[in-house]
């Protein structure tokens, strides 16, 4: 392990943190939980405690940003630099910033929480098998109502566990329609819309009317984001896959690597690639926000990079489902803060 010059560290043990903003890649509750679990790794082996607060005078301010984001260390787009953190100290020191040009996940693909179905709100499992085929995104296959769904286990055929994916046909968010689903088609400014639109807005948010005529009823909601099918790169970045789509005369109802030599999954963002040539890459496994945050919080607590490749503080991202802290990480953080105190022995109780 290595520490910053002069063993920079916090001089109090009750560390506070503020989540200043969020990535749209994950539900807020999942982000909150990832950060809490990342802090818990360090509190488990030291006397430190971490308390979430809701003001900018927190010791550790957590922020998602892209490119130039208000400090002297701009981010670099997708991949490469995932995040950075400043060593302990006042102001921006101790803060942790995450590059929102990454796809943040829990390391195993986009996290898509489900509603209804029979899986109690469990997240989709990508890829999953349905009727012998592999799906890497929510699908409407097998349904006549057009509602996208997914399996919450690796194999729907054997486990029969599913839920519905975020969809404007199921519900909307915010707006003024109490979460009612979109009504397609709907009239807005005299024009007919059969899909969510950003028309009439300057912030780029997709919305729809929840009745057949917005001009008359003024009822609307925002369309849920579809992280599983929002494409990256290609010539349609940020748009949604359209399933099914036609490619070389054949119909595809999930992402495909056909036509590519590198095996990367892609989809069309219109129903016909052959005529429209609009496409993008489907989401990859993403980076584990939990693991990256645990590493960055190590920096924010005073740890520099480790030379031990298996250590959490080694300067390369590596996905693992095992315990993230290596003995070297524990030795490093204890060098700065000491071990977690043993609980006081309690006297025996009599009844």
């Amino acid at each position: 392990f290595q520490t910053f010059e002069g063993d920079l560290k916090w001089h109090h043990h009750n560390i506070t943190y503020w989540i200043q903003n969020y990535s749209e890649d994950l539900p807020r509750a999942v982000i909150d939980d990832a950060f809490a679990r990342a802090f818990a790794l360090w509190s488990a082996v030291t006397p430190l405690t971490f308390t979430r607060v809701y003001s900018r005078d927190a010791d550790i301010v957590i922020q998602f940003g892209v490119a130039e984001h208000g400090d002297g260390y701009p981010f670099d787009g997708k991949d490469g630099l995932l995040a950075h953190a400043f060593p302990p100290g006042p102001g921006i020191q101790g803060d942790a910033h995450f590059d929102d040009d990454e796809l943040w996940s829990l390391g195993k693909g986009v996290v898509v929480p489900t509603r209804f179905g029979n899986a109690d709100g469990a997240a989709c499992h990508f890829p999953f098998i349905f009727e012998g085929r592999s799906y890497s995104a929510c699908t409407t296959d097998g349904r006549s109502d057009g509602l996208p769904w997914c399996s919450t286990t690796a194999n729907y055929d054997t486990d029969d566990r599913f839920g519905f994916c975020p969809s404007e046909r199921l519900y909307t968010q915010d707006g003024n329609a109490d979460g009612k689903p979109c009504q397609f088609p709907f009239i807005f400014q005299g024009q007919s819309y059969s899909a969510c639109t950003t028309d009439g807005r300057s912030d780029g948010y997709r919305w729809c009317a929840t009745t057949a005529n917005y001009d008359r009823d003024k009822l609307f909601g925002f369309c849920p984001t579809r992280a599983d099918s929002t494409v990256m790169g290609g010539n349609s970045a940020g748009e949604l896959c359209v399933f099914p789509f036609t490619f070389l005369g054949k119909e595809y109802s999930t992402c495909t690597s056909e036509g590519r030599g590198d095996g990367r999954l892609w989809c069309a963002t219109t129903s016909n690639f052959d005529s429209d040539k609009k496409w993008g890459f489907c989401p990859d496994q993403g980076y584990s926000l939990f693991l990256v945050a645990a590493h960055e919080f190590g920096h924010a607590l005073g740890l520099d990079h480790s030379s031990v490749p298996e250590a959490l503080m080694y300067p390369m991202y590596r996905f693992t489902e095992g315990p993230p802290l290596h003995k070297d990480d524990v030795n490093g953080i204890r060098h700065l803060y000491g071990p977690r105190p043993e609980p006081e022995p309690r006297p025996p109780t009599t009844t």
Epitope: G72, L81, A83, H84, A85
Partner: antibody, heavy 124, light 107 residues
Framework: EVQLLESGGGLVQPGGSLRLSCAAS???????DMWWVRQAPGKGLEWVS?????????FYADSVKGRFTISRDNSKNTLYLQMNSLRAEDTAVYYC?????????????????WGQGTLVTVSS | EIVLTQSPATLSLSPGERATLSCRAS??????LAWYQQKPGQAPRLLIY???YRATGIPARFSGSGSGTDFTLTISSLEPEDFAVYYC?????????FGQGTRLEIK
């Protein structure tokens, strides 16, 4: 011992091109962000460009954007600056410099090692 | 972009005297300020990073202080080899910028 050695400077006409190189040794080159900084005769220091350790992301001062391209070859421990459409105001000593910080370890502001510089003169 | 203003432009002192150089930022840069020394015909040399930390091999007579917008480089007792041009540089916000320099000359 850390060493940075620039080469490739010289006299070039306005509109011409030059490629500067900076050979690095004595540290793990691939771990560090690398910079080009220039100094016009009798003037102060001006940053030109930076390339992050991973080699992809690059940033440029407004005065050179669209004309200069920074790159690196981590297998050769070498930093490059391709300079096109050169102007008289690009005349300067060009230094390559190593950042103290690397990757996601930030906040240690400063360039701890510099090359000796290579003179670029743009004149007709 | 953040403008760094160094003062004085020129400082004339004798060996053994104390030198105080100032660098003021147009907006707060926390402690992300470095100081460099440059002698004629040579590359700049890092003296101080993050406002107050001495770089490797820099004598203890050099010290830095300040945070936010006002920073100071102090040379407690000038040696003959200290007469040079001194630059400050910030990375509290993007892009990085340098001050215009202070020339420290022998009186």
């Amino acid at each position: 011992e850390v060493q940075l050695l620039e080469s490739g400077g010289g006299l070039v006409q306005p509109g011409g091109s030059l490629r500067l190189s900076c050979a690095a040794s004595g540290f793990t080159f691939s771990w560090y962000d690398m910079w080009w900084v220039r100094q016009a005769p009798g003037k102060g220091l001006e940053w030109v460009s930076v390339i992050y350790s991973s080699g992809g992301p690059t940033f440029y001062a407004d005065s050179v954007k669209g004309r200069f391209t920074i790159s690196r070859d981590n297998s050769k421990n070498t930093l490059y600056l391709q300079m096109n459409s050169l102007r008289a105001e690009d005349t300067a000593v060009y230094y390559c410099a190593k950042d103290r910080a690397y990757g996601d370890y930030v906040g240690w502001n400063g360039f701890d090692y510099w090359g000796q510089g290579t003179l670029v003169t743009v004149s007709s | 972009e953040i403008v760094l203003t160094q003062s004085p432009a020129t400082l004339s002192l004798s060996p053994g005297e104390r030198a105080t150089l100032s660098c003021r930022a147009s907006q707060s840069i926390s402690s992300f300020l470095a100081w460099y020394q440059q002698k004629p015909g040579q590359a700049p040399r890092l003296l101080i990073y993050d406002a107050s930390y001495r770089a490797t091999g820099i004598p203890a007579r050099f010290s830095g202080s300040g945070s936010g917008t006002d920073f100071t480089l102090t040379i407690s007792s000038l040696e003959p080899e200290d007469f040079a041009v001194y630059y400050c540089q910030q990375r509290g916000n993007w892009p990085i910028t340098f001050g215009q320099g202070t020339r420290l000359e022998i009186k």
